[in-house]
């Protein structure tokens, strides 16, 4: 039987909560890595690919050491929301061109959505201040060409890959301080 009605729930161990968030982040990172390999194989594109609408990488090494849990989770959630928007945009705008990557892109979007919900839950469990709803972001312009869309895909997956590594590092560092 659970606790009697009205009694406070036992607060979950924050380290265990962070651990499961790290594992979900790493599984998403592996999905991203495998999808990046497929993208490079099917649509090779040399050089750096940037997309102005993507978030800039959150932190450098020095800043990582000074991080606090609220700022990591807040920043990570904001960045991942942006990547989720970009993945949705990519699937809509490039549906036919990226058909060969479609099941994996769908899986990636689902897991990204799940990680965002996990971060939201973690923030409420740790009694961190809840963010106001995000203002609606301006719509992303459709890619100017198929090639532009492919370059955008490289930029989105590359940025997400690096953001997730930063996230894992930040969360692991914070876990040791709890």
């Amino acid at each position: 039987p659970g606790p009697p009605p009205g009694s406070p729930r036992a607060s979950p161990d924050p380290r265990a909560e962070l651990d499961s968030t790290v594992l979900l982040t790493r599984s998403l990172l592996e999905d991203t890595r495998q999808l990046t390999i497929q993208l490079k194989d099917k649509f090779p594109a040399d050089g750096d690919h940037n997309l102005d609408s993507l978030p800039t990488l959150a932190m450098s090494a020095g800043a990582l050491g000074a991080l606090q849990l609220p700022s990591v989770l807040t920043r990570l959630r904001a960045d991942l929301l942006s990547y989720l928007r970009h993945v949705q945009w990519l699937r809509r705008a490039m549906g036919s061109s990226l058909k060969t990557l479609e099941p994996e892109l769908g899986t990636l979007q689902t897991r990204l959505d799940r990680l965002l919900r996990r971060l939201q839950l973690l923030m409420s469990r740790l009694a961190l201040p809840q963010l106001p709803p995000d203002p609606p972001a301006p719509p992303l312009a459709p890619p100017s060409s198929t090639w532009g869309g492919i370059r955008a895909a490289h930029a989105i997956l590359g940025g997400l890959h690096l953001t997730l590594d930063w996230a894992v590092r930040g969360l692991l560092l914070l876990k040791t301080r709890l």
């Epitope: 090494a61 020095g62 990582l64 997730l164 590594d165």
Partner: antibody, heavy 119, light 111 residues
Framework: EVQLVQSGAEVKKPGASVKISCKAS????????MDWVKQAPGQRLEWIGD????????IYNQKFTGRATLTVDKSASTAYMELSSLRSEDTAVYYC????????????WGQGTTVTVSS | DIVLTQSPASLALSPGERATLSCRAS??????????IHWYQQKPGQAPRLLIY???NLESGVPARFSGSGSGTDFTLTISSLEEEDFATYYC?????????FGQGTKLEIK
């Protein structure tokens, strides 16, 4: 060809420090982490830590925290590991290894650098 | 830290035979759809070489006679038909938590 080339063997006295380099070629340096692994005679392989070349931000095995320092020179595609306050148990082969981001498995290894600590 | 125990410590077989190497973890290393176990081969005087990552994925360039399986705490590396160059020491490694740790190794020798 993807390669990691490490600096040569070192002989050090107890209490001294050693700095090993690992030069990467044949791939985009920033796309992978660089990990360091110790193999002492008759012991298991032991992970020391890793560093993300883009972010910096090393992560260390607690056992080596405070004694190991991982750095990178992005412009030279080179990673470094410095180990301080050397003792006889640090006598080992040290490997750099390319690691998938945040996954800690190692698909390309350097040839190893033998460090001997002896008075 | 998670402890990995490999068995047997050594194994003597002939070329053409099937080799089955075991790795047991002190706690589950499978979660969120992935099993964080990897296998390496090491020959004397050489660096380890990645064979299998994430329990069952064959690393590029590794012959198809190598395969990995398992989940939870029990994992297996199988070499379907041994070749002369397969006689070496094999290590499993986990990356479920930090620090990643390695098994003590299984030495595969020619009978």
């Amino acid at each position: 060809e993807v390669q990691l080339v490490q600096s040569g063997a070192e002989v050090k006295k107890p209490g001294a420090s050693v700095k090993i380099s690992c030069k990467a070629s044949g791939y985009t340096f920033r796309d992978y982490n660089m990990d360091w692994v110790k193999q002492a005679p008759g012991q298991r392989l032991e992970w020391i830590g890793d560093i993300n070349p883009t972010i910096g931000a090393p992560i260390y095995n607690q056992k080596f925290t405070g004694r190991a320092t991982l750095t990178v020179d992005k412009s030279a595609s080179t990673a470094y590991m410095e180990l301080s306050s050397l003792r006889s148990e640090d006598t080992a082969v040290y490997y750099c290894a390319r690691g998938a981001l945040a996954h800690w498995y190692f698909d390309v290894w350097g040839q190893g650098t033998t460090v001997t600590v002896s008075s | 830290d998670i402890v990995l125990t490999q068995s047997p410590a050594s194994l003597a077989l002939s070329p053409g035979e099937r080799a089955t190497l075991s790795c047991r973890a002190s706690k589950s290393v499978s979660t969120e759809g992935y099993s964080y176990i990897h296998w390496y081969q090491q020959k004397p005087g050489q660096a380890p070489r990645l064979l299998i990552y994430l329990a069952s994925n064959l690393e590029s360039g590794v012959p198809a006679r190598f395969s990995g399986s398992g989940s939870g705490t029990d994992f297996t590396l199988t070499i379907s038909s041994l070749e002369e160059e397969d006689f070496a020491t094999y290590y499993c490694q986990h990356s479920r938590d930090l620090p990643p740790t390695f098994g003590q190794g299984t030495k595969l020798e020619i009978k």
